[in-house]
């Protein structure tokens, strides 16, 4: 019962998390104009992964897509990639976990198979959550870097009479949505992995005992229902997850400008 609850809760938490990752990826408010130096502006700028927008006080909002692929900062491309990988892995994980749910019966699927599927989906959720957290964190780091760079620029060369206020950007709502969603997906994945242990029938580690029947002897070896680590194979001690997944995007240089309109 506890296993079913853990598995079900893990599924629901992951579902909410992946929905959040999708929402964050689609949102336009990844970075929003910092109003600290100009709180009385009648024009408000905000940017997402796919387009930048301007909202006027009049209510008129204009959004322009980033119609170039090569002209965008490498870090933005990396963030896009991480979020998409997170969504794809999460979606596959959800699909696998639906069939792995203990409360759903599909043909004569054994518990061992369900355990494997639960573990697989759990790992997928963990990686999906990590991708989202990494993507959002990379973007946040890029914002912080550019924020201080533009702050330094603001206070240099202001000796003239004309004042030019450089637009600075700070954390947008999508970052917080992404962090929370990534965290939820991660938690859901861990719960699925925990549930997997309960789903797999315990292997009793008794020594083989010989029973002597009249006439001839037959040896019975208990513990034949060991949970398999693959969907079809029953290979023992097979390592299916390294846990040391590393993206190529970790060694990217920061763009000199964040304003990629």
């Amino acid at each position: 019962m506890a296993v079913t609850a853990c598995q079900g809760l893990g599924f629901v938490v992951s579902l909410i998390g992946i929905a959040g990752i999708i929402a964050a990826t689609c949102m336009d408010q990844w970075s929003t104009q910092d109003l600290y130096n100009n709180p009385v502006t009648a024009v408000f700028n905000y940017q997402g992964l796919w387009r930048s927008c301007v909202r006027e006080s009049s209510g008129f909002t204009e959004c322009r897509g980033y119609f170039t692929l090569l002209g965008l900062p490498a870090m933005l491309q990396a963030v896009r990639a991480l979020m998409i990988v997170g969504i794809v892995l999460g979606a596959i994980g959800l699909l696998v976990s639906i069939f792995a749910l203990k409360c759903i019966r599909i043909g004569s699927m054994e518990d061992s198979a369900k355990a494997n599927m639960t573990l697989t989906s759990g790992i997928m959720f963990i990686v999906s959550g990590l991708c989202a957290i990494a993507g959002v964190s990379v973007f946040a780091n890029m914002l912080v870097t550019n924020f201080w760079m533009s702050t330094a620029n603001m206070y240099t060369g202001m000796g003239g009479m004309v004042q030019t206020v450089q637009t600075r950007y700070t954390f947008g709502a999508a970052l917080f949505v992404g962090w929370v969603a990534g965290g939820l997906t991660l938690i859901g994945g861990v719960m699925m992995c925990i549930a997997c242990r309960g789903l797999a029938p315990e292997e009793t580690n008794y020594k083989a005992v010989s029973y002597h029947a009249s006439g001839h002897s037959v040896a019975y070896k208990p513990g034949g229902f060991k949970a398999s680590t693959g969907f079809g194979s029953n290979t023992k001690n097979k390592k299916i997850y390294d846990g040391g997944a590393r993206t190529e995007d970790e060694v990217q240089s920061y763009p000199s400008k964040h304003d990629y309109v």
Epitope: N38, A42, V43, Y46, S57, G59, F60, T164, T167
Partner: antibody, heavy 117, light 113 residues
Framework: QVQLKESGPGLVAPSQSLSITCTVS????????VSWIRQPPGKGLEWLGV???????YYNSALKSRLIISKDNSKSQVFLKMNSLQTDDTAIYYC???????????WGQGTTLTVSS | DIVMTQSPSSLTVTAGEKVTMSCKSS????????????LTWYQQKPGQPPKLLIC???TRESGVPDRFTGSGSGTEFTLTISSVQAEDLAVYYC?????????FGSGTKLEIK
Amino acid sequence: QVQLKESGPGLVAPSQSLSITCTVSGFSLTDYGVSWIRQPPGKGLEWLGVIWGGGSTYYNSALKSRLIISKDNSKSQVFLKMNSLQTDDTAIYYCAKHHYGNACDYWGQGTTLTVSS
Amino acid sequence: DIVMTQSPSSLTVTAGEKVTMSCKSSQSLFNSGNLKNYLTWYQQKPGQPPKLLICWASTRESGVPDRFTGSGSGTEFTLTISSVQAEDLAVYYCQNDYSYPFTFGSGTKLEIK
């Protein structure tokens, strides 16, 4: 079609307060902002303040302490209240509707206010 | 507050002539988010309320004759009338629509000989 019409007292004694109403038609006050602008006789335009569709207000820094702009969406009316009037507040008072670019695309004909004892 | 400075304060021209008037702001009115300048030009004919001519520094309002052209960016803007007509007799105002308060320039009075 879009129309704005200002109505005011016409004559007000110094140190008294003023209330002008702008009645609009052809658009909703929940969707568009309305600004108040005045023009003293023979002089230029002076922006007084704005009330946006969401209800947020911004005022001319020099007149902020004396001004209140409010509205009644259901009656399609915008109100300008100004206290401690002086003779230099004598002007034509206009209300104008905002559109994209934060510019004012429609203006009322204006109401003349004279501050005199 | 942003200070808007218009020059000249008045000009007298003959019909058919090209006219240029200037508007300068104390701060940049350029928004990097949409690459637009939040400067508006109004025309006020005698005894009438102002009329919107140009917004975003160069976008002509519908119904405005194409002889009116707005240009400039950042802090320096220009309104050009390519061939002045008798009906263009008016005062022309520029306005900052970028940050509060939405200040107006003092105006340029256009007179026809």
